[in-house]
Interface confidence: medium
């Protein structure tokens, strides 16, 4: 027998630094955890103990603070060549800054391979990108050599910006003749890593012939076996293990998100390449496991040029810019209709002749909004007024509702109004008129929604049964502020771009803005 | 082969404005920051400020922030800097130079271009 | 902003000598072990070279007559068997914080 010891990370989006318990800024740091400098300590010390060794990432290492903000992905590649990464899988925020803002700092920088079965190359891009990405990588791993297979959400040309010149093919019929390749090669233990959420996870186990482990992403996805150390609550067992068509147990592993727990899989394979054995658990990258020095020296020197940044002007603003607690959970505030448009605008994907958008609807908790900006500071914006504005460290996530889910939310919304409560919904592409003459639970009498499969872009009444998508706080797609609804009943959730970075980028594209009340939300007559 | 390469002398009237280039070779431009830095006849180096060509971050020295912007054009790979209100004592030779702060050298200078002379007078 | 000083402000020497240059920052620019002060030589009518980044690290081509060291705010750099072609100014320069500022220099002259 030979065993082999998988360490694996997915959906880091930019934690270099370590982070709070939930991920955001660290505050106390004796309480923190995460960040490559820990990450570093804890995979040199199973290096040290363990003779076969793979250090994998299931990609969206891009997006989602300051550091992707300013270095642009040149900080990936530097870090996870430090930290001696073995294979990477793209993921859909690797083409957030379109596919020259993946190869000039992440493809042509990285010292290890990156990989993606099912994403394929046309035009002039083909021979531009031959070579940075590939669909596989065989590793010698001591004496034996192991196959890593690639693959990406093929929704990623809704979820990011890789242009006209990359197809996503399905994934299962583009692993497949990859995997046949390898078996041709002589290669008989195949690792399928790969940015496709859970639910794809599981069926690749299951339908590709020949993957003996799959190591997934994009789902946040936490698995654990016995009691979890710290908040998050399993989805399931770890490793997961699914019945393969064939008859095999192939086990399915992610690691959350966050770079908050290292995966920790040890597999065992017979010397014909199947899977005797595998169990592990993620690790918790807590404060019990010191930062390495050099790396976080590293840290510190890098960080040098990211303080100045945050009080740079991005952009200005001639208005007021309401976001204070007095209106926007109380009615409609310009603040909301701004992070509401920025939103959308950053979610603009013209992938269908039919529609002008794949998406035209925002909601915004109220009580999401921490701060207004004061136009009469020579009308500057900087990324510090933003922090105070969205200080929370979150994502605006893209989610598909049925019509009801979404007439349930502005129910919600004003179920207890008057109470300055946080989830009095602030929003872009709905006309909603509320009565609050009605019992809760019936007070919304108008709720219309602009129209994606159209020209001309025009409001029509909601329709219950429709399937809609939606741009909304993480927090919301989570349940938060009571949204018990949004989480139990979304059909699909796909996480965004960090929300300070939506709205800066957002700004500095307008270069002057003048948000408006503009009759949004209303209040019908006598009730307000 | 890593090189900067300047834009030629420059002959400037008080009052004026001057924009010199920088055209870099050998490594990718958008993962290195570029500094600009001065030095007037027989004096020492100052540092006016830099750029990071892949996000176009910018940092200047307070000295010089309401006259001096940087730029940077990643098409091409070439930096710019632009002094405005031009006066006696800008009279200098303008350096660009790549700073190694994303490998080893820490935002030292590693590489520098070979000096543009602005001569302001009236 | 950082003051960075340097002392002497010239320093004539033979050519087989010591030279020991001093570079004083207002403040510490140290940290986590690593010291954020570089050194570069230039000569009249050339651009400043590179000669010693983060206070004792010989950057790649430097001849290794030159040495550098120091930790917080006192720094040195050292010219071991001093050549002719040593004649020149050296600069050191700070990156601990924006902005970043150099020294007025040493200038060094050969008999």
């Known amino acids: 027998a030979w065993e082999l010891t998988i360490l694996h990370t997915n959906d880091v989006h930019s934690r270099l630094e370590q982070t709070s318990e939930d991920s955001s800024k660290c505050v106390n740091a004796s309480r923190c955890m995460g960040g490559v400098a820990r990450l570093f300590t804890k995979v040199q010390q199973i290096r040290r103990a363990e003779p076969n060794v793979l250090l994998l990432d299931a990609g969206d290492q891009y997006q989602g603070t300051i550091w992707f903000t300013v270095y642009k992905g040149a900080e990936v590649a530097h870090f996870m060549n430090a930290l001696r990464y073995d294979a990477m899988a793209l993921g859909n925020h690797e083409f957030d800054n379109g596919v020259e803002g993946l190869i000039e700092p992440l493809l042509k920088e990285a010292k290890f391979p990156i990989l993606s079965a099912n994403i394929k190359a046309k035009g002039p891009l083909a021979s531009q990108i031959s070579g940075l990405y590939l669909p596989y990588k065989v590793l010698p791993v001591g004496d034996e050599v192991v196959g890593i297979v690639g693959y990406t959400s093929k929704e990623t040309p809704f979820l990011s910006n890789p242009g006209t010149n990359l197809v996503f093919e399905d994934e299962i019929t583009a692993l497949q003749p990859e995997v046949d390749k390898l078996k041709t090669l002589n290669v008989n233990k195949i690792i399928a890593l790969g940015h496709s959420g859970f639910e794809m996870d599981k069926l690749i186990a299951q339908k590709v012939r020949g993957v003996d482990v799959v190591v997934g992403g994009h789902s946040n996805t936490f698995l654990y076996t016995g009691n979890p150390p710290s908040k998050e609550v399993p989805a399931g067992k770890y490793p997961f293990i699914v019945t393969s068509d064939d008859g095999r147990k192939v086990p399915v592993v992610q690691a959350y998100a966050f770079g908050k727990y290292l995966g920790y899989l040890k597999i065992e394979f017979d010397e014909r390449g199947n899977v005797i054995s595998s169990h592990g658990n993620p690790i918790l990258l807590n404060s019990s496991i010191p930062e390495d020095p050099s790396i976080k020296a590293d840290i510190n020197k890098w960080r040098i040029k990211l303080d100045n940044y945050s009080t740079q002007e991005l952009g200005k603003t001639i208005v007021y810019l309401d976001g204070s607690s007095q209106s926007c959970r109380f009615r409609e505030c310009n603040m909301g209709n701004l992070i509401c448009d920025a939103m959308i605008n950053n979610n603009l994907r013209h992938t269908d002749e039919m529609f002008w958008n794949h998406v035209s609807m925002c909601i915004l908790n109220g009580g999401g909004i921490r701060s207004p900006i004061d136009e009469r500071n020579n009308g500057t914006i900087t990324w510090e007024n933003l922090a105070a504005v969205l200080p929370f460290g979150g994502t605006f996530d893209l989610v598909q509702l049925k019509g009801s889910t979404l007439k349930k939310a502005f129910e919600h919304s004003v179920h207890r109004y008057g109470q300055s409560t946080g989830e009095f919904l602030q929003v872009g592409g709905i006309h909603v008129v509320y009565d609050l003459s009605r019992k809760p639970g019936d007070r919304v009498v108008k709720l219309d929604v602009l129209c994606t499969k159209c020209r001309v872009p025009s409001y029509d009444p909601l329709k219950m049964d429709e399937v809609y998508k939606v741009i909304l706080p993480n927090f919301l797609a989570n349940g938060g502020d009571g949204f018990q609804m949004i989480k139990d009943e979304l059909l699909r959730h796909d996480s965004g771009d960090q929300d300070i970075n939506v709205v800066s980028t957002y700004i500095s594209k307008m270069k002057v803005i003048y948000p408006a009340v503009e009759g949004r939300i209303k209040f019908s007559t006598g009730s307000h | 082969e890593v090189q900067l390469v300047q834009s030629g002398a420059e002959v400037k009237k008080p009052g004026a404005t001057v924009k010199i280039s920088c055209k870099v070779s050998?490594?990718?431009?958008?993962?290195?920051?570029i500094t600009w830095v001065r030095q007037a006849p027989g004096q020492g180096l100052e540092w006016m400020g830099d750029?990071?060509?892949?996000?176009?971050?910018?940092n200047y020295n307070e000295k010089f922030k309401t006259r001096v912007t940087i730029t940077a054009d990643k098409s091409t790979s070439t930096a710019y800097m632009e002094l405005s209100s031009l006066r006696s004592e800008d009279t200098a030779v303008y350096y660009c130079?790549?700073?190694?702060?994303?490998?080893?050298?820490?935002?030292?200078?590693?590489?520098w271009g070979q000096g543009t002379l602005v001569t302001v007078s009236s | 902003e950082i003051v960075l000083t340097q002392s002497p402000a010239t320093l004539s020497l033979s050519p087989g000598e010591r030279a020991t240059l001093s570079c004083r920052a207002s403040?510490?620019?140290?940290?986590?072990?690593?010291?954020?002060m570089h050194w570069y030589q230039q000569k009249p009518g050339q651009a400043p070279r590179l000669l010693i980044y983060?206070?004792?690290n010989l950057e790649s081509g430097i001849p290794p007559r030159f040495s550098g060291s120091g930790y917080g705010t006192d720094f040195t750099l050292t010219i071991n068997n001093i050549e002719s072609e040593d004649a020149a100014y050296y600069f050191c320069?700070?990156?601990?914080?924006?902005?970043?500022?150099f020294g007025q220099g040493t200038k060094v002259e050969i008999k």
């Open positions: 750029i990071y060509p892949g996000s176009g971050n910018t």
């Open positions: 403040k510490n620019v140290s940290t986590s072990g690593y010291s954020y």
């Open positions: 050998g490594y990718t431009f958008t993962s290195y920051w």
């Open positions: 130079a790549k700073e190694g702060g994303l490998t080893t050298e820490d935002y030292a200078l590693d590489y």
């Open positions: 983060l206070a004792s």
């Open positions: 320069q700070h990156s601990r914080e924006l902005p970043f500022t």
